[in-house]
């Protein structure tokens, strides 16, 4: 169910309208909804959520984290800087997203509406960023490269890339879920 | 099972600092979405959060004592350290870690130490 | 700040009586309202999360709900152990605040 269509809010006609915040966190915490179903099917289906040799596809890897510098966390928080550095990382989740397309079999529907509702959510932002021209969007040609590079991996590193995109990008959401709180 | 212990001294004079250590077991201080904060309850009254730290080392500290506290964690020993600066006896009270996880950032504490008086 | 403000300070009921506690906030928290028990002597423990989701091993007599500024923690059929004193607590933004209590006497 999309965020702002649940029951709660059916049963609750005297609620005002969700404020642009109650939106973005309503958004966020239904995408990681969608993050902790595909973990599931992909921690079922390999053993990839207890192997210690991650660090052998993340160097393959360069998935957006949150940093010191990046203004989101308390000590140094910056509301503007923060701001572009969670669309920036968002925008550059989006490849990797696309490669989780095809690797589901039971969560199929539910990866496509993890990836949608990141569009949706990188649309909320955008309304309340005010620095657009900070906002530095991925080349399509490098994506499409990318794309290619990873789904021409081993099967055992498609599964482990699968697990950290979705570890990484559920860590990163956290933490913007956490920041635009203190906005 | 989740486990908090807290540590540390339980008589301090005026103007020393209060070093207190929170050793957990049952959980990792590196997954995401997992924090520990302190909360402090002089005897027969409210509960007052201190400082939190998460996964990341992101911190939080309570604006009327931030310039008091600071707060660590060393996630190889499973520990988490509140030093607290020129102690007054107002700070007397029951000083508790506590655990925060879960994937939507609820802030709620859902394992408490048992807790140490401090006077 | 968020302020929270927890009505009423105290209140005494019977074995088997239902109890409604308030919690408001001076600010919307969206549902980030969580609630604690504690007994004397004893530290806090979670009973509610996130407005009305009960925590595991909490029992079904305890019902969170409420959203925005206004909560409520109702306890039906009360029993001996729920004696003690109920806290609310801000979990929308730091700095995280804890309402003053409720003291329930059974």
């Known amino acids: 169910v999309p965020p702002g269509e649940d029951s709660k809010d059916v049963a609750a006609p005297h609620r005002q309208p969700l404020t642009s915040s109650e939106r973005i966190d309503k958004q966020i915490r239904y995408i990681l909804d969608g993050i902790s179903a595909l973990r599931k099917e992909t921690c079922n289906k390999s053993n990839m959520c207890e192997s210690s040799k991650e660090a052998l596809a993340e160097n393959n890897l360069n998935l957006p984290k949150m940093a010191e510098k990046d203004g989101c966390f308390q000590s140094g928080f910056n509301e503007e800087t923060c701001l572009v550095k969670i669309i920036t990382g968002l925008l550059e989740f989006e490849v990797y997203l696309e490669y989780l397309q095809n690797r589901f079999e039971s969560s199929e529907e539910q990866a496509r509406a993890v990836q949608m509702s990141t569009k949706v959510l990188i649309q909320f932002l955008q309304k309340k960023a005010k620095n657009l021209d900070a906002i530095t969007t991925p080349d399509p040609t490098t994506n499409a490269s990318l794309l290619t590079k990873l789904q021409a991996q081993n099967q055992w590193l498609q599964d482990m890339t699968t697990h950290l995109i979705l570890r990484s990008f559920k860590e990163f959401l956290q933490s913007s879920l956490r920041a635009l709180r203190q906005m | 099972q989740v486990t908090l212990k807290e540590s540390g001294p339980t008589l301090v004079k005026p103007t020393q600092t209060l070093t207190l250590t929170c050793s957990f077991s049952?959980?990792?201080?590196?997954?995401?979405?997992?924090?520990v904060g302190w909360v402090r309850q002089p005897p027969g009254k409210a509960l007052e959060w201190l400082a939190f730290i998460w996964w990341d080392d992101d911190k939080y500290y309570s604006p009327s004592l931030e310039s008091r506290l600071t707060i660590t964690k060393d996630t190889s020993k499973n520990q988490v350290v509140l030093t607290m600066t020129n102690m007054d006896p107002v700070d007397t009270a029951t000083y508790y870690c506590?655990?925060?996880?879960?994937?939507?950032?609820?802030?709620?504490?859902?394992?408490w130490g048992q807790g140490t008086l401090v006077t | 700040d968020i302020q929270m403000t927890q009505s009423p300070s105290s209140l005494s009921a019977f074995v088997g009586d239902g109890v409604t506690m308030t919690c408001w906030a001076s600010q919307s928290i969206n549902d980030y309202l969580n609630w604690y028990h504690q007994r004397p002597g004893e530290a806090p423990e979670l009973l509610v999360f996130a407005a009305s989701n009960l925590q595991i091993g909490v029992p079904s007599r305890f019902r969170g709900s409420g959203s925005e500024t206004y909560f409520t923690l109702t306890i039906n059929s009360l029993q001996p152990e729920d004696s003690g004193t109920y806290f609310c607590?801000?979990?929308?933004?730091?700095?995280?605040?804890f309402g003053g209590g409720t003291k329930l006497e059974i």
């Open positions: 607590q801000n979990g929308w933004s730091f700095p995280l605040t």
């Open positions: 049952g959980f990792s201080l590196s997954t995401s979405g997992v924090g």
């Open positions: 506590a655990r925060s996880a879960d994937d939507y950032l609820y802030y709620s504490f859902d394992t």
